[in-house]
């Protein structure tokens, strides 16, 4: 049996930050699990890991330098990403592994979420402030 994962098809990261919710066909309550977010069509870059082990507190880390946090729901993990670059626009895949109790479970590969990172654009001030043109 495989866990099914649902993700938004696309998200826009304004202010270089985004929240990506991974929804699972499995209740993570009282389970030992490892939820992770991967970047790229080949999922080559592990962006963030959220590890749950029965306790109230989730352990969050990134081996690839991404600034992330997480939040656990009964059947979801939301990844919060900060300080994204425009060139980190890509497709991101949620992955879930349940280690305990047996049997070990993981997910069918999801369709992923395209995260479009919008750059910060500064609008130049008009030389002569006045009524704006339509």
């Amino acid at each position: 049996n495989k866990i099914l994962v649902k993700q938004s098809p696309m998200l826009v990261a304004y202010d270089n930050a985004v929240n990506l919710s991974c929804k699972y066909s499995y209740n993570l309550f009282s389970r030992e699990f490892r939820a992770s977010l991967h970047k790229g069509l080949d999922s080559a870059v592990e962006v963030c890991v959220v590890y749950g082990n029965y306790s109230q507190q989730l352990q969050v880390y990134s081996k690839t330098g991404f600034n992330c946090d997480g939040k656990l729901g009964n059947e979801s993990v939301t990844f919060y990403l900060q300080n994204l670059y425009v060139n980190q626009t890509d497709i991101y895949f949620c992955k879930i592994e349940v280690m305990y109790p047996p049997p070990y479970l993981d997910n069918e590969k999801s369709n992923g979420t395209i995260i479009h990172v919008k750059g910060k654009h500064l609008c130049p001030s008009p030389l002569f402030p006045g009524p704006s043109k339509p």
Epitope: L58, V60, D69, Q82
Partner: antibody, heavy 120, light 107 residues
Framework: EVQLVESGGGLVQPGGSLRLSCAAS????????MHWVRQAPGKGLMWVSR????????SHADSVRGRFTISRDNAKNTLYLQLNGLRAEDTAVYYC?????????????WGQGALVTVSS | EIVLTQSPATLSLSPGERATLSCRAS??????LAWYQQKPGQAPRLLIY???KRATGIPARFSGTGSGTDFTLTISSLEPEDFAVYSC?????????FGQGTKVEIK
């Protein structure tokens, strides 16, 4: 006035344990991420651990993951760091620091520090 | 992780002189860089955040510039209380990292 006061430091043998506390006052403790940052003698600062505002998530530096545990009691306005499996290289002054829950890792107030010495 | 290199290690100056401290990152940290002041036996104090914004209560003689990989902290005219160790810190990438510090001492 924002105040962070660490306690619980001391001399411990290699392999031993210690629990540091940080009592917070002068601000809404439950609204801030809290951190531990350490400074070994004659060395620079090094980030150790963090916990988010409600205590639901935590992160640790690679060098302490699996040995140190950060926790908080928002009812008591207190931050904790449980140090297990201590090594000589963990000898340092340990500071607690607060960070806004939007910037995560920008430390705007620090405590005076607690000295942890690991030696046989 | 991102390595921050500060230079010089020590700066010997007299009160009233201008101090220029450098912090270089091993890769871009955008403008997510802070500067802290630390005196012996005291807690570090946030001076500058986001590369150029002065923290609350910090005198105007402290200023920060730079973005990407090269950053500078300038103290326009040193006061006796400014002799201390100054550290930079990035929060762009995880984990956050600090420079090794620059000591500003009285000449």
């Amino acid at each position: 006035e924002v105040q962070l006061v660490e306690s619980g430091g001391g001399l411990v043998q290699p392999g031993g344990s210690l629990r540091l506390s940080c009592a917070a006052s002068g601000f809404t403790f439950s609204s801030y991420w809290m951190h531990w940052v350490r400074q070994a003698p004659g060395k620079g600062l090094m980030w150790v651990s963090r916990i988010n505002s409600d205590g639901s998530t935590a992160s640790h530096a690679d060098s302490v993951r699996g040995r140190f545990t950060i926790s908080r009691d928002n009812a008591k306005n207190t931050l904790y760091l449980q140090l297990n499996g201590l090594r000589a290289e963990d000898t340092a002054v340990y500071y607690c620091a607060r960070a806004d829950s939007t910037t995560w890792y920008e430390f705007d107030f620090w405590g005076q520090g607690a000295l942890v010495t690991v030696s046989s | 992780e991102i390595v921050l290199t500060q230079s010089p290690a020590t700066l010997s100056l007299s009160p009233g002189e201008r101090a220029t401290l450098s912090c270089r990152a091993s890769q871009s940290v955008s403008s997510y860089l802070a500067w802290y002041q630390q005196k012996p036996g005291q807690a570090p104090r946030l001076l500058i955040y986001d590369a150029s914004k002065r923290a609350t209560g910090i005198p105007a003689r402290f200023s920060g510039t730079g973005s990407g990989t090269d950053f500078t902290l300038t103290i326009s005219s040193l006061e006796p209380e400014d002799f201390a160790v100054y550290s930079c810190q990035q929060r762009h990438n995880w984990p956050p990292t600090f420079g090794q510090g620059t000591k500003v001492e009285i000449k």
